[in-house]
């Protein structure tokens, strides 16, 4: 690895550093499918963007292997806790990899938001935030799931979102 | 752009990399103004610092354009949910830009913390955390707002804070 | 500092950039000691890793000084709020430094999760997330504490965790 090679590497690194992989995807009316699949996301409009990562059917797809800080927030809300809806909400980030048939839990939260309703108001709001560093290989995917997704409130992309950046 | 130019760029980049923009601002007694404006923050004492970002009247001001992970946490608390205080709390990060007259919502949470009071204790505590990646131009500002800010509890700068770093 | 020196520095920086310090530690059965000490963490198995940081008795130990985004999430849960258990939970990240005899609060949250139990179910779940940028010197340590730790629920390392990366 001579000087020229090193030089090329440095130039290359500078260029790649300029596009340190990052993404921020936002909630949209189409996010909740009701199909049992992961949440879907807006990738281009408003605050949403992809830089050095790609997107496919709800998933952030890694193009460059490395350690990523991944995060998601979901806005929850309702009026009381209707029968048949889970009183415990699970919000999680999951990895899909060609090496395993099933999704792998990465970061997960469980909350009981309905208890936030008060005697004077049955309306409640709650928010769940997850964030942490995980190693991801090229081609691996990360998705967000919420059970029961009917309690997720979407409005304008600021209250429920999903993102990542390489660290 | 010859070798000398590239060399200068690399040297420059190395120097700028040494000061990757970052900041962490902390809550203080003066944070809550009651004026309807954004929360104000400590920028120097204790854990607070600014590196490659500046501060003005509650706002983190961007000096170098790019993608930033911005975050804020606020500690909420009270005794019961007094009449006339919002039972729904909105905690948000907002962008100010010379290009628009109004603030733009970036990341927002709504919570109903008063429902956390129990039959045995009217005291309740709750915490709201927001974080996400947004693109910011030089000169743009980010502020934190909480409605109703009277439910924000300040103590020592560790419970309510606001920060950012370039990714 | 001639061209050769600068070249060496750049090569060195590229190498160090490859190992930008980062870690993600996960909750395990041994995390809760009941001894009044900090939570303990898994450092190698599953999603856990250390890169450019070390670990000692629950603490992330800094080897390279700088600004770090540190974070922790704990999963809380219970059935009602048994007498003798604090109805207010404190979850915090604390710094240990050779320069002071006592731990220093960095980021702290207080929550009243028991209020999440509903009339129809005494079971409740809650989650607390903390994250923020702090300056850490080589040799300084960061630990996580939860009071009352008996309300922390551990399962598989995805619900309670602790991490950091240099920014």
């Amino acid at each position: 690895d001579g000087p020229a090679g090193s030089w090329e590497q440095l130039i290359q690194e500078r260029r790649s550093h300029e596009v340190n992989p990052a993404a921020h995807l936002t909630g949209a009316n189409s996010s909740l499918t009701g199909s049992g699949g992961p949440l879907l996301w807006e990738t281009q409009l408003g605050l949403a963007f992809l830089r050095g990562l790609s997107y496919h059917d709800g998933a952030l797809v890694v193009t460059k292997a490395g350690y990523y800080y991944i995060y998601s927030k979901v806005q929850l809300g309702g009026v009381g806790c209707p029968l048949g809806l889970a009183s415990t909400i699970t919000h999680g980030l999951y990895k899909r990899t060609p090496r395993y048939p099933e999704e792998l839990e990465l970061l997960v939260s469980q909350q009981s938001p309905c208890g936030r309703a008060t005697s004077s108001s049955r309306v409640w709001w709650d928010s769940s935030f997850l964030g942490g560093v995980v190693h991801l290989e090229a081609g691996e995917e990360v998705v967000v799931r919420v059970l029961d997704e009917r309690l997720v409130r979407l409005r304008d992309g600021t209250r429920s979102y999903f993102g990542a950046f390489m660290v | 752009d010859g070798p000398a130019g590239s060399w200068e760029q690399l040297i420059q980049e190395r120097r700028s990399h040494e000061v990757n923009p970052a900041a962490h601002l902390t809550g203080a007694n003066s944070s809550l103004t009651g004026s309807g404006g954004p929360l104000l923050w400590e920028t120097q004492l204790g854990l607070a610092f600014l590196r490659g970002l500046s501060y003005h009247d509650g706002a983190l001001v961007v000096t170098k354009a790019g993608y930033y992970y911005i975050y804020s946490k606020v500690q909420l608390g009270g005794v019961g949910c007094p009449l006339g205080l919002a039972s729904t709390i909105t905690h948000g990060l907002y962008k100010r830009t010379p290009r628009y007259p109004e603030e733009l919502e970036l990341l927002v949470s709504q919570q109903s913390p008063c429902g956390r009071a129990t039959s045995s204790s009217r005291v309740w505590w709750d915490s709201s955390f927001l974080g996400g990646v947004v693109h910011l131009e030089a000169g743009e500002e980010v502020v934190v707002r909480v409605l109703d800010e009277r439910l924000v509890r300040l103590r020592d700068g560790t419970r309510s804070y606001f920060g950012a770093f370039m990714v | 500092d001639g061209p050769a020196g600068s070249w060496e520095q750049l090569i060195q920086e590229r190498r160090s950039h490859e190992v930008n310090p980062a870690a993600h530690l996960t909750g395990a059965n041994s995390s809760l000691t009941g001894s009044g000490g900090p939570l303990l963490w898994e450092t190698q198995l599953g999603l856990a890793f250390l890169r450019g940081l070390s670990y000692h008795d629950g603490a992330l130990v800094v080897t390279k000084a700088g600004y770090y985004y540190i974070y922790s999430k704990v999963q809380l849960g219970g059935v009602g709020c048994p007498l003798g258990l604090a109805s207010t939970i404190t979850h915090g990240l604390y710094k240990r430094t050779p320069r002071y005899p006592e731990e220093l609060e960095l980021l702290v949250s207080q929550q009243s999760p028991c209020g999440r139990a509903t009339s129809s179910s005494r079971v409740w779940w809650d989650s607390s997330f903390l994250g923020g940028v702090v300056h850490l010197e080589a040799g300084e340590e960061v630990v996580v504490r939860v009071l009352d730790e008996r309300l922390v629920r551990l399962r598989d390392g995805t619900r309670s965790y602790f991490g950091a990366f240099m920014v």
């Epitope: - | 009270g78 005794v79 019961g80 007094p82 009449l83 009217r122 009277r150 439910l151 | -």
Partner: antibody, heavy 121, light 111 residues
Framework: QVQLVQSGAEVKKPGASVKVSCKAS????????VHWVRQAPGQGLEWIGA????????SYNQKFKGRATLTADKSTSTAYMELSSLRSEDTAVYYC??????????????WGQGTLVTVSS | DIVMTQSPDSLAVSLGERATINCKAS??????????MNWYQQKPGQPPKLLIY???NLESGVPDRFSGSGSGTDFTLTISSLQAEDVAVYYC?????????FGQGTKVEIK
């Protein structure tokens, strides 16, 4: 300046009802609670309840729940306290007061001049 | 309900002297470093007037000879140098929980 002006004195028979008004001026009526406090002759102060004119929400001292009704009319910036099933021990001066907050701690920073309600057969 | 007990019931103090009124709550009225305790002054034929809120904060326009202190269950209102216009009945009041309750009052007179 902030002013709370109450209606005039009333004399009522036992079992009747009384409705006292409190007209606010000098501040945004919908942004503050209006509390009602009474003081029997030569006695101390007793909190009846409060109304939040912003949305009409109320909070009552259980002692008066069912007999006291607190309302507010945003269009006229006026709060009302109606007390039913009057008895002689309800004879008192009734005050309205504006409720402000320091964090979540309430205090009464402006008071009306008081309305004497006399219950006598 | 939280019971507020004031002492003494009445107090005679010389002009220019210090007057001290105590108030005891039946349970703590503290939260996160704040005490949910207020003090009012009432002169004959007038409504009460706010003096001190949250135990120690002086209401705007109130002379600084008035001060409040205390925490938990025990609170004090102090008039550092009694003036003739301070003759009145003084009430403590807790706003920690409904129903808000007042002390029975302390009458301050000139000796």
């Amino acid at each position: 300046q902030v002013q709370l002006v109450q209606s005039g004195a009333e004399v009522k028979k036992p079992g009747a009802s009384v409705k006292v008004s409190c007209k606010a001026s000098g501040y945004t009526f919908t942004s503050y609670n209006v509390h009602w406090v009474r003081q029997a002759p030569g006695q101390g102060l007793e909190w009846i309840g409060a109304v939040y004119p912003g949305n009409g929400d109320t909070s009552y001292n259980q002692k008066f729940k069912g007999r006291a009704t607190l309302t507010a009319d945003k269009s006229t910036s006026t709060a009302y306290m109606e007390l039913s099933s009057l008895r002689s021990e309800d004879t008192a001066v009734y005050y309205c007061a504006r409720g402000s907050y320091y964090y979540t701690s309430s205090y009464f920073d402006h008071w009306g001049q008081g309305t004497l309600v006399t219950v006598s057969s | 309900d939280i019971v507020m007990t004031q002492s003494p019931d009445s107090l005679a103090v010389s002009l220019g002297e210090r007057a001290t009124i105590n108030c005891k709550a039946s349970q703590s009225v503290d939260f996160d470093g704040d005490s949910y305790m207020n003090w009012y002054q009432q002169k004959p034929g007038q409504p009460p007037k706010l003096l001190i809120y949250t135990a120690s904060n002086l209401e705007s326009g109130v002379p600084d000879r008035f001060s409040g202190s205390g925490s938990g269950t025990d609170f004090t209102l102090t008039i550092s140098s009694l003036q003739a216009e301070d003759v009145a009945v003084y009430y403590c009041q807790q706003s920690y929980e409904d129903p808000f309750t007042f002390g029975q009052g302390t009458k301050v007179e000139i000796k």
